[in-house]
């Protein structure tokens, strides 16, 4: 018998769209094999409707579409604007038709319920609201009008113009009774549950002269749609409910066991543990739709997802819904990268971050995390030579090692540097990742001076003592500056006296700034690399003063200064304020990238759920002249 | 909580008929799908068939074993679903349980399947 597995009978009704699961085993083979959908006809061929090589018949354009799901061995067929020439028997398979990898469907499509005569339907989405038009007669404008529910062979009671209302609709029905002018009435049914389904009769006067007028109602639960993403990589839920909930509390959650829908994130400020420095509920525009941004995806984010609205805050019945079914591919192409990078006070981390190595000319972002509210991640640096004020000196974002990595450095850390940070880039979305900085205690590894102070015309040395566990490394001076840190000569002075138990591998290594001008002042790093991946940094500020007496200076550990409360930037920089302004692309549009380093006078994009907020001061490496 | 109550059980000779329910009362209203899985003594569960559905679409899914005897249906006002067993055989002796499931990724898979009904003892005799 075939492995092949799927519906044996599917029953829909005319303009409907059905959602068809063929199950296979999940060989290598089979996964790349071709899969398709064909129709069986009256001697015994079966032709192709549509195919995974992306073929599909005329029959089937534009209203048609086969996904491959090769991590669960499941292929879907979804077929939309049904009419009863659909009807007949198919065939879902995989390779060639007339071979035996295959499961026969019967799809049935009819022409709707019995209705009686006369009927107006209804189809409207769970959640959403109704209203059902009721025509009557001048002889009955000032009689009694009601809606009754057809319950098995009765009809029962909805709502009247007397002022009844069903224990079951109370508090979200309404009946509207048109203007003089116009013959008609209105019964408005809100927050539309499953059971509300089923025929209606509406009603104008209760005797033999009466007006009556049927309806069949249809509430549409979402087909959940397939979202199929990479293990560490990030998904986005668009949610759209429309403008009758723009005001109205939204949440995303996610089915756990029975009908329990587990809050992810909400307005109301609630979110899960597990999400986390993960997650950004995007801000709801006037119509009423949001989007929710989920980052570092694992193997156990896979499951159904609902995002609806409600005053709770919560999944309740009623709510309007849309729903997605997210499977993780852990056949991955975004590679491994530490989740939690740890950092000692004072020192440094070098944190590495992925990207499609296809776009290796897009622009690259580092964001931190930010709670507050919805979440929201204002940007830190980027790869075109903006760095926030307050990381000047501190913060480096580096093309290197390329070929699909960027590195980020953060040194003189401080326990308020702890938190979740976002890697991305103004390309591909789904290749966002996060990264945890963890400050632990300990000592830096490498040794200089707190802050220097060198004169102008004359000869600075300042020392980096490096301890021999950092033989092997690469040792280097740099010049920090917003583009990133240029490379300086350097001396090697031969083993440092700076560290108790280390041999004579432990190093000092000494930067040399003759004849100083005031364009030498800035801050400087010193650090360890091997080839591109670079390792621990420490930084020092180097001042500029005049000085009479000539000489040259040399810095010693016990002469350094604390380091400076406050870097004055020099008269040709202004510190630019950031608006935050939202980016369209770090929210997963397929919209143009407009360049934002200039977008109002210099401000920059965050990852932003919140509104125009000042984000501090920013620096760039080109003036700004007033 | 969505509870699950299965009826009409019993003990009939081979070739005949039995029709279960399975009636589901609660917060139903997340629910995707109902299947009927049996488990005959010393055995393990095995999946029988299920019905799931969106709308006034249902998706209706059978073991090889069972294909061509046994349909599935339900009835929406009800909140109901019945197994109609026809030509029934001594190898379809068990208990069957009804199950309802709010995401199914495979009908197949007894985990899948959020809540269970008590069971019915179906006993064909030769």
């Known amino acids: 018998k075939s492995p092949i597995f799927g519906p044996e009978e599917v029953n829909s009704v005319e303009g409907n769209s059905v959602s068809i699961t063929c199950y296979y085993p999940p060989t290598s083979v089979n996964r790349h094999t071709r899969k398709y959908w064909c129709r069986q006809g009256a001697r015994g061929g079966c032709i192709t409707l549509i195919s995974s090589e992306g073929y599909v018949s005329s029959k089937y354009a534009g209203r048609a579409n086969l996904t491959n799901f090769p991590e669960n061995g499941t292929f879907v067929v979804n077929i939309a604007q049904l009419s009863q020439d659909d009807s007949g028997r198919y065939k879902c398979g995989l390779g060639i038709n007339s071979r035996g990898l295959s499961f026969d469907v019967s799809l049935e499509v009819s022409q709707g319920p019995g209705l009686l005569n006369d009927t107006k339907v209804y189809t409207v989405d769970l959640g959403r609201t109704v209203t059902i038009n009721c025509p009557f007669k001048t002889e009955n404008a000032q009689k009694r009008k009601s809606l009754y529910k057809q319950i098995g062979l009765y009809p029962v009671l909805v709502i009247d113009s007397s002022g009844y209302v069903n224990p079951n609709y109370t508090g979200r029905i309404r009946l509207d009774i048109q203007g003089t002018g116009q013959l008609l009435f209105s019964v408005v049914i809100n927050q539309l549950r499953l059971s509300d389904a089923g025929q209606y009769l509406c009603q104008a006067g209760d005797d033999s002269n009466s007006n009556k007028k049927n309806a069949d109602l249809q509430v549409l639960k979402p087909e959940p749609e397939l979202v199929y993403e990479d293990l560490r990589g990030s998904v986005t839920f668009h949610c759209a409910l429309g403008p009758e909930v723009a005001n109205v509390a939204k949440f995303l959650c996610r089915q756990s066991s029975g009908e329990n829908c587990d809050v992810v994130v909400n307005t109301l400020g609630k979110r899960a543990p597990a999400f986390e420095g993960r997650i950004l509920l995007n801000p709801q525009d006037k119509d009423g739709s949001f989007s929710v941004v989920i980052t570092g995806l694992r193997k156990e984010d896979a499951g159904r997802y609902l995002c609806g609205a409600h005053s709770d805050g919560q999944l309740q019945e009623g709510s309007p819904i849309q729903a997605w079914q997210l499977f993780v591919n852990e056949e991955s192409t975004i590679p491994r990268s530490p989740t939690v990078v740890k950092g000692v006070a004072g020192s440094s981390v070098a944190v590495l971050c992925p990207y499609n190595r296809k776009e290796s000319k897009s622009i690259k972002y580092w964001c931190l995390w930010e709670g507050a509210q919805n979440g929201r991640c204002p940007l830190l640096v980027d790869s075109e030579g903006w760095v926030k004020a307050q990381y000047e000196g501190r913060l480096s974002l580096l093309e290197e090692p390329g070929n699909g990595t960027f590195t980020v450095i953060l040194n003189q850390l401080t326990s308020r540097d702890a938190g979740f940070y976002w890697c991305l880039t103004n390309g591909d979305t789904l290749w966002r990742t996060t990264v945890e900085i963890k400050i632990i205690e300990g000592e830096p590894n490498l040794k200089v001076p707190g802050n220097v102070t060198a004169v102008l015309g004359e000869t600075l040395k300042v020392p980096c003592h490096f301890p021999c566990k950092f033989s092997s490394y690469e040792k280097y001076w740099c010049k920090w500056n917003n583009t990133g840190c240029q490379a300086l000569p350097s001396q090697d002075e031969g083993p440092s006296k700076a560290f108790v138990n280390c041999d004579e591998n432990s190093r000092l290594v000494s930067l040399t700034l003759n004849l100083v001008t005031r364009a030498d002042e800035g801050w400087y790093w010193c650090g360890v690399k091997q080839g591109h991946f670079y390792g621990e940094t420490a930084a020092v500020y180097v001042a500029v003063e005049e000085r009479k007496a000539a000489g040259s200076r040399d810095v010693s550990l016990a002469k350094a200064d604390a380091a400076p409360d406050e870097k004055v930037l020099d008269s040709g920089f202004r510190e630019i304020e950031n608006k935050a302004i939202q980016d369209p692309r770090l929210f997963a549009e397929e919209k143009a990238v407009a360049d934002t380093r200039d977008q109002a006078d210099g401000s920059r994009a965050s990852v932003d759920s919140g509104s125009s907020e000042e984000q501090g001061g920013s620096s760039r490496h080109h003036h700004h002249h007033h | 909580e969505v509870q699950l109550v299965e009826s009409g059980g019993g003990l009939v000779q081979a070739g005949d008929s039995l029709r279960l329910s399975c009636a589901a009362s609660g917060r139903t209203f997340t629910t995707y799908g109902v299947g009927w899985f049996r488990q005959a003594p010393g055995k393990e569960r095995e999946f029988v068939t299920t019905i799931t559905w969106s709308g006034s679409t249902n998706y209706k899914y059978y073991a090889d074993s069972v294909k061509g005897r046994f349909t599935i249906s339900r009835d929406n006002a009800k909140n109901t679903v019945y197994l109609q067993m026809n030509s029934l055989k001594p190898d379809d002796t068990a208990v069957y349980y009804c199950?309802?499931?709010?995401?199914?990724?495979?009908?197949?898979?007894?985990?899948?399947?959020?809540?269970w009904g008590q069971g019915t003892q179906v006993t064909v005799s030769s």
């Open positions: 199950a309802a499931s709010t995401v199914l990724t495979d009908p197949r898979v007894p985990t899948e399947y959020d809540y």
